[in-house]
Each structure stands twice: as structure tokens, then as C-alpha cells.
């Protein structure tokens, strides 16, 4: 199965809005999507969100900080394909995030 294709849809100083897509023929096999994220440089802890939809907003994040985000499709049989590990950055308080 093809891995989810992930996009950054929007961001603020404390949140990242992430969406993803998979080919329609595969969608019926997916039960939920698991979004794993952590601060870049912090390999000791990570957060997990599960959703049935194709998007999620990650809240309570630190400003001007890069997060590693990966989306995994979950099927009834177990874990499906996982996306690339993406790096998304929240805005800085001055709104000058590059």
C-alpha cells in the first residue's frame, strides 16, 4: 500500500495543522490514522494522536520550534504504510518564522 502523503496546511505560534491523502482504493481498508509527533532533538518522548479523518491540528506546541511529524495508516490487520518523517515549524512570536 502507498504511504500517506502529508502536507502542512497552516500553523500558528503554538499549533500545526496537518493533512494527508492516500489513493481512494486504499481508503476503505484504513480504520484510523495515527499521527506521531515530537520536538526535533527530543528523541526521548513523543506524542500520538489518532483520528478517522484526513487532518489534525496539533496544539499546545512551543513557538518557533521544529516538530517531527509522521502519519501511519491503521488497518484492521494492523499497521499499514507510514509516511515520511516530516519537519514542520511553528511560527515565532514575532510572526517571522522562515
Amino acid at each position: 500500500t502507498e504511504p500517506p502523503k502529508v502536507r502542512l496546511e497552516g500553523r500558528s505560534t503554538t499549533s500545526l495543522s496537518v493533512s494527508w491523502s492516500i489513493p481512494p482504493p486504499q481508503q476503505s481498508r484504513v480504520w484510523k490514522y495515527e499521527v506521531t509527533y515530537r520536538k526535533k532533538g527530543d528523541s526521548n518522548s513523543y506524542n500520538v494522536r489518532r483520528t478517522e479523518g484526513f487532518s489534525v491540528t496539533l496544539d499546545d506546541l512551543a513557538p518557533d520550534t521544529t516538530y517531527l511529524v509522521q502519519v501511519q495508516a491503521l488497518t484492521q490487520e494492523g499497521q499499514g504504510a507510514g509516511s515520511k518523517v516530516h519537519e514542520f515549524q511553528t511560527l515565532s512570536p514575532e510572526g517571522s518564522g522562515n
Epitope: L8, L16, Q89, N98
Partner: antibody, heavy 130, light 108 residues
Amino acid sequence: QVQLQQWGAGLLKPSETLSLTCAVYGGSFSGYYWSWIRQPPGKGLEWIGEINHRGSINYNNYNPSLKSRVTISVDTSKNQFSLKLSSVTAADTAVYYCAKPLRPHCINGVCYSGDAFDIWGQGTMVTVAS
Amino acid sequence: SYVLTQPPSVSVAPGQTARITCGGNNIGYKNVHWYQQKPGQAPVLVVYDDSDRPSGIPERFSGSNSGNTATLTISRVEAGDEADYYCQVWDHSSDHVVFGGGTKLTVL
């Protein structure tokens, strides 16, 4: 088209400090992570480290195997970045390259750590011998 | 730290297809970049982000990446393709660039 031109001493004695500089011509300097990479004779490529200047802060990242001996610095007024490697030994004999990543580090919140290197310096052969 | 494994050498006849592999744990989750290096020259980027080509690189060069193996494919191989080829990734665990050991492509 961006070009990288590098220079520095090519012959060192053991325990001395290697010093190389790379000048960036024809393109943007800020926003990129600029890297140094080396290649011992007949061997593969080894990443040394990188530097990014954002705002008034330098962000450095070094290969753990060399971290204790490496310093990468930047002179934004000249669009140059430099490598210093202390306490060299014969094992540091190599061709040293500076390199530019394909994309700025972050574009609209999407970041590219470890991006592909699309522009390389001409290389500087550094020999360490007593 | 993260390790990328390449075969030391690959041989192919002119006009045939060469496949150079780059193995790493769950490498499919990473973006893989490929370089060509000829003797006495700096490396040249031939494929980035698994399968994209920089401008000026022939369509004969293509890439794929899945599971634990990334592959650089060179179709209709020419004598001028003889070179060393290196793969590269970013290791998110250690936050540094990792290169494969390199593969010498010989055109018979």
C-alpha cells in the same frame, strides 16, 4: 547560479589546526545550512558539520565523531563560512568540500534537515604529515 | 548511529540497466539523495527526495525508496556513467547527515 570557492592550507603537521574558508557567490546566504564534508583518499564521503545564521544567532550541528575538535563559523558580511579542525592527525588527511543544500532550511514552515547538496566547492586536499 | 549499506561495486554492459541499492533500517521513512562522483571531481547530485532529478540530469537516472532499501536505477547505461555513487539521508535520531559507503559502477 550559486558558486562556492574554498581555500586554506593544504599541508599540516600533526597536532596543528586545519583551517578552511568557503565563499558563496551569486546567491542568498541566509536561511541555508552550509556544510563541510570530507573524503579521505580512496574512501567515501564523511559529513563534518553545518552552520545556519538566522537573526543574530548561529546554529551549529556537528558529526558526533568529530564534535570535540570541530568549529564552523560564519562571516555574513562576506558571505563566507569557515571550518577549523584542531589536533589533526594523519587520519584527517582528506579532500575537504564545502557544500550548499538544495533548499533553504525552512520554507513556510516546512523544513529540510539533511537536504540534498546541489552545489559543492572545488575541494581542498589537506595532507597531515610530520 | 544510522548506517547506510551499499554494495562496493556493480558492473553492467553498455545499454543495459544498472541498479544500485542503499540499505538502511526503515529507510522508506526518509528522503534519500544520490550523488555521482568521477575521479578527481566533486560529487554531483543526480537524484533527490528519493526520485526527483535536478535540472540537467538525464531521465535515464531514476530512484525509488521503500521499506529498508532505496534504489538508484540508471537505464541505457553509457560509458560516461562509470563513477562512484553515494546515497545520503538525514538521521533524525542523531540529527546529522549520513552517507552510504559508495558503489563503484563499472561499465563493461
